[in-house]
Interface confidence: medium
């Protein structure tokens, strides 16, 4: 296999393959519960687990929630796909001042160049408008009246917005926070950044730093302050906390400045398909006792299904893994990750990701 000669329905009578007339070759038939990653799979590795809608299969073969672009200042750049998250970006007229994984934690309106400045580079979803001094012989036919002002002393290479107090701020420099839609009309009336030294003559502070949160007394820890419902990840990026809004989820730990909210299945349910800091699918089942882990199994038996080829070893619940390895830990909980194809990251791949707390009760696999 593949075969180039047509066979109706079967390929040499092999039940694990079928003939695809469209591509005129024999293709591997994915076992039940697994879905093909291409039109004509050739081997078991061309089959993948199916995640719930609005989840994608991450690099560790875990079902992970796609980010949502539901905030007023965000729009969808790329949709949620089977193997990649939805990507959000700031809506037109705004740029991202504090990035988040696959999204933006804080969007600002593009600055309008002040008097004496003209647009060098228009603002994008990622970058603010870049201004440059107007040449003495600038044509009156300017794109914007604001860009036709007489040159003034002092130049700024980029009009960098700052989250300043509303009394001195224009809409062009105000962040739009979740749930608040600033009317474009208001933004168009307040077009020019204030001609003050704080906004024109010198660079502002990092928009990601909260001006309302001074350093703690006796501490130099002026950490980056993320938007509500975002946390600062290990790479220093503001990352959206997961949501526990699904009926079968409850909040285990809240969204903190440096850690995501974590969700777990509500009482009486356990996690059958893990998601980072959450659970993609909760099912009303118990799991192995606290002392047990699941034996590794052959690739052919991952997500053991109707037609899983009878290869490899049988996965059982045993006191210790067959290979003597201790169960892998994925913080914050000790976890029995038994997701399909999770062997890339953990030595105990079978089929329903669950975790055990120190009490032996099932808790969510935080991924």
């Amino acid at each position: 296999f593949p075969q180039d000669r047509p066979f109706e329905d079967t390929c040499h009578g092999n039940p694990s393959h079928y003939y695809d007339k469209a591509v005129r070759r024999c293709c591997y038939r994915c076992p039940m519960g697994l879905f093909p990653t291409q039109q004509c799979p050739q081997r078991p590795t061309d089959c993948r687990k199916q995640c719930e809608p609005d989840y994608y299969l991450d690099e560790a073969d875990r079902c992970t929630a796609c980010v949502t672009c539901s905030r007023d200042d965000l729009v969808e750049k790329t949709p949620c796909a089977w193997n990649s998250s939805r990507v959000c970006e700031c809506r037109p007229g705004m740029f991202c001042s504090t990035s988040a994984v696959n999204s933006c934690a804080r969007c600002f309106f593009h600055s309008v160049c002040p008097a004496g400045m003209i647009v060098k580079f228009p603002g994008t979803a990622q970058k603010n408008t870049v201004c440059e001094p107007a040449s003495p012989g600038v044509s009156p036919a300017c794109a914007s009246p604001e860009n036709c002002k007489e040159p003034s002393s002092g130049t700024i290479p980029q009009a960098k917005p700052t989250p300043v107090s509303p009394a001195t701020s224009s809409a062009s420099t105000m962040p739009v926070r979740g749930g608040t839609r600033l009317a474009q009309e208001a933004a168009s009336k307040l077009t020019r950044a204030p001609d003050s030294p704080s906004s024109v003559g010198r660079p502002s502070s990092d928009p990601g730093l909260s001006p309302t949160q001074p350093c703690p007394e006796g501490s130099g820890d002026c950490r980056k302050q993320c938007e509500p419902d975002y946390y600062l990840d290990e790479a220093g990026r503001c990352t959206a906390c997961v949501s526990c809004s699904r009926d079968d989820l409850v909040e285990k730990t809240p969204c903190a400045w440096n850690s995501s909210r974590t969700c777990e299945c509500r009482p009486g349910m356990i996690c059958a398909t893990s998601a980072t800091n959450s659970c993609a699918r909760c099912v009303p089942y118990p799991i192995c006792a606290a002392e047990t882990v699941t034996k590794p199994q052959d690739m052919a038996e991952k997500d053991t299904t109707f037609e899983a080829p009878p290869l490899g070893t049988q996965p059982d619940c045993n006191p210790t893994p067959e290979n003597g390895e201790a169960p892998a830990s994925t913080s914050p909980t000790q976890s029995l990750l038994v997701d399909s194809q999770a062997s890339k990251t953990l030595p105990i791949p079978t089929s329903a990701p669950v975790a055990l707390s120190s009490t032996g009760k099932p808790v969510l696999d935080a991924g």
Epitope: F306, P310, L311, P315
Partner: antibody
Framework: EVQLLESGGGLVQPGGSLRLSCAAS????????MSWVRQAPGKGLEWVSG???????YYADSVKGRFTISRDNSKNTLYLQMNSLRAEDTAVYYC???????????WGQGTLVTVSS | QSVLTQPPSASGTPGQRVTISCSGS????????VYWYQQLPGTAPKLLIY???QRPSGVPDRFSGSKSGTSASLAISGLRSEDEADYYC?????????FGGGTKLTVL
């Protein structure tokens, strides 16, 4: 709450056809594999057919070539088209959800198919 | 004739422990998980044991499953009258799914 409701059973003559339906609710239908399992009167359970990815279908040898399983994810419905029916196909046909290695975790109440002249 | 072999009947008195066996081959039980289903009279089957020895929520811990090689067994301890039912073992085989012939359990 997960619910599976079969319909379409009835009396049919040998050689005839019948189409069974299974209406699913309470879960994301398109994300699960589904199956038909039958039980002849006073007999044991027999797996008939399964469906995963839309064009990936699976059949017991006893029905291969005569039965066709299909699904309509937009209607959350599973189907079993039964042609060339035989007396030995007489059974209660159950629709069952299959989830990874949990097996058939939810079953419908079944619909009776009687093949008799 | 079923691919998996079960005794057609078993019986016990209330409080007793009863074991139902299921014998297969390397292509089904030997290389895959075993499941047990309970079918009470006049009702649809219900998942009783999955992944050889795991119980779904709601299934009493009186029910336990085990597997060794190409055989599996279901044990019911502290037998009750409501346990009177048909019990089926099941396993995968290459590209299909097989059931045992079923065991009728009678509570005397």
């Amino acid at each position: 709450e997960v619910q599976l409701l079969e319909s379409g059973g009835g009396l049919v003559q040998p050689g005839g056809s019948l189409r069974l339906s299974c209406a699913a609710s309470g879960f994301t239908f398109s994300s699960y594999s589904m199956s038909w399992v039958r039980q002849a009167p006073g007999k044991g359970l027999e797996w008939v057919s399964g469906i995963g990815y839309p064009y990936y279908t699976y059949y017991a040898d006893s029905v291969k070539g005569r039965f066709t399983i299909s699904r309509d994810n937009s209607k959350n419905t599973l189907y079993l088209q039964m042609n060339s029916l035989r007396a030995e196909d007489t059974a209660v046909y159950y629709c069952a959800r299959y989830y990874y290695d949990y097996g058939f975790d939810y079953w419908g109440q079944g619909t009776l198919v009687t093949v008799s002249s | 004739q079923s691919v998996l072999t079960q005794p057609p009947s078993a019986s016990g008195t209330p409080g007793q422990r009863v074991t139902i066996s299921c014998s297969g081959s390397s292509s089904n039980i030997g290389s895959n998980y075993v499941y047990w289903y309970q079918q009470l009279p006049g009702t649809a089957p219900k998942l009783l044991i999955y992944r050889n020895n795991q119980r779904p929520s709601g299934v009493p811990d009186r029910f336990s499953g085990s597997k060794s090689g190409t055989s599996a067994s279901l044990a019911i301890s502290g037998l009750r009258s409501e346990d009177e039912a048909d019990y089926y073992c099941a396993a995968y085989r290459s590209y299909d799914y097989v059931f045992g012939g079923g065991t009728k359990l009678t509570v005397l």
